[in-house]
């Protein structure tokens, strides 16, 4: 699986999850998030050669098409597969609120 | 929606579904598929600016991050959203077989 366990331990050029730390205030301008200051959102990147963690029959077909027609612009793209939520603390006036934001952390990638 | 109805009628630079005809024999080397000879598989391409058909909170966050940090390599990617099956005819020896291959035709795209 193209997950953090594999990708963070290997120098993988092809599609894999990459570490990306996002600071809410500095990187997003989100001053309203009090906790955490930031988090590892991570991201997916790298080429998708034929059969590499293909998401659907279409991505398999497109990967093969791209292999046999290397000049073609059509190829699968490395995108998030498994995502996890992130719990944040913010304030509405003087009242603290805790919310779980879904699909915030990329744990693995796929070729789609 | 970034579907064929919209994308095929507009000159859209950003993420959209694009027409792509694949000939099974010539483009994939699949001699075993006898009908159809080929089909419109289509593909997704184009930049994913902030908020464009964002698939998850992560893609929204990544889109904003990319907007505020344009030098960053991390950005959402334009990938298939809705896919449709394709029915094919092939032969196992002298016996004809019809099979519906799932997720073969891209009908719309999203930024993921």
């Amino acid at each position: 699986a193209l997950d953090t366990n594999y990708c963070f331990r290997n120098l993988e050029e092809n599609c894999c999850v990459r570490p990306l730390y996002i600071d809410f205030r500095q990187d997003l301008g989100w001053k309203w998030v009090h906790e955490p200051k930031g988090y590892y959102a991570n991201f997916c990147s790298g080429p998708c050669p034929y059969l590499r963690s293909a998401d659907t029959t279409h991505s398999t077909v497109l990967g093969l098409y791209n292999t046999l027609n290397p000049e073609a612009s059509a190829s699968p793209c490395c995108v998030p597969q498994d995502l996890e939520p992130l719990t944040i603390l913010y304030y509405v006036g003087r009242t603290p609120k805790v919310e779980q934001l879904s699909n915030m952390v990329v744990k693995s990638c796929k070729c789609s | 929606a970034l579907d064929t109805n919209y994308c095929f009628r507009n000159l859209e630079e950003n993420c959209c579904v694009r027409p792509l005809y694949i000939d099974f024999r010539q483009d994939l080397g699949w001699k075993w598929v006898h009908e159809p000879k080929g089909y419109y598989a289509n593909f997704c391409s184009g930049p994913c600016p902030y908020l464009r058909s964002a698939d998850t909170t992560h893609s929204t966050v990544l889109g904003l991050y990319n907007t505020l940090n344009p030098e960053a390599s991390a950005s959402p990617c334009c990938v298939p959203q809705d896919l449709e099956p394709l029915t094919i005819l092939y032969y196992v020896g002298r016996t004809p077989k019809v099979e519906q291959l799932s997720n073969m035709v891209v009908k719309s795209c999203k930024c993921s």
């Epitope: - | 001699k31 006898h34 009908e35 005819l89 032969y91 020896g93 002298r94 004809p96 019809v98």
Partner: antibody, heavy 119, light 111 residues
Framework: EVQLLESGGGLVQPGGSLRLSCAAS????????MSWVRQAPGKGLELVSD??????????YYSDSVKDRFTISRDDSKSTVYLQMNSLRAEDTAVYYC??????????WGQGTLVTVSS | DIQLTQSPSSLSASVGDRVTITCRAS??????????MHWYQHKPGKQPKLLIY???NLASGIPSRFSGSGSGTDFTLTISSLQPEDFATYYC?????????FGGGTKVEIK
Amino acid sequence: EVQLLESGGGLVQPGGSLRLSCAASGFDFNSYGMSWVRQAPGKGLELVSDIVSKTYNYTTYYSDSVKDRFTISRDDSKSTVYLQMNSLRAEDTAVYYCTVAPGGSFDYWGQGTLVTVSS
Amino acid sequence: DIQLTQSPSSLSASVGDRVTITCRASQSVSISRFNLMHWYQHKPGKQPKLLIYRASNLASGIPSRFSGSGSGTDFTLTISSLQPEDFATYYCQHSRESPWTFGGGTKVEIK
């Protein structure tokens, strides 16, 4: 260009044997089933025998009229298909065509070889 | 085995005529939307030639005056305007199941 060249036909007495050969070129012989179709004088086309590719275990078919007398085989290394005909009868007299069916239809045919069974 | 019955068994026609040959199968030779019936032209002393595959698809190099239609058990070969070189015997053939079989043939003669 696809070419199918039959040989081995001729005059033979009833009860005798003949071996027909069909040398193929111009296509991926290993991938396709090969067939022998015959036409007896004044009759229509009849599928006599058939052999599919290695992928499908070289499965063979014989029409009822030739079963247990004819044997089809192929040599993929030589791109050749054979029809061994034993215990020949007068009713086996026909032009025998070698043909290839990539997808249900017989797309290519050889020129045919005449087999005459007569005393 | 699936039997194929062609009609007529022979016909006389003139150059320029529209000719229709039918082929009826003893059971359906269609599977899903695919019609597994094929048509051939056979002239004396020559090898048969594929005209139409899967009911309605024109084989490579075949003139557009030839066309095919049908599904299930009933199929038709049509020559829109008969030419001198079209006088021959025509056969249908199915590939719905093994064994594949041919129809008895239709001989098209000059009137």
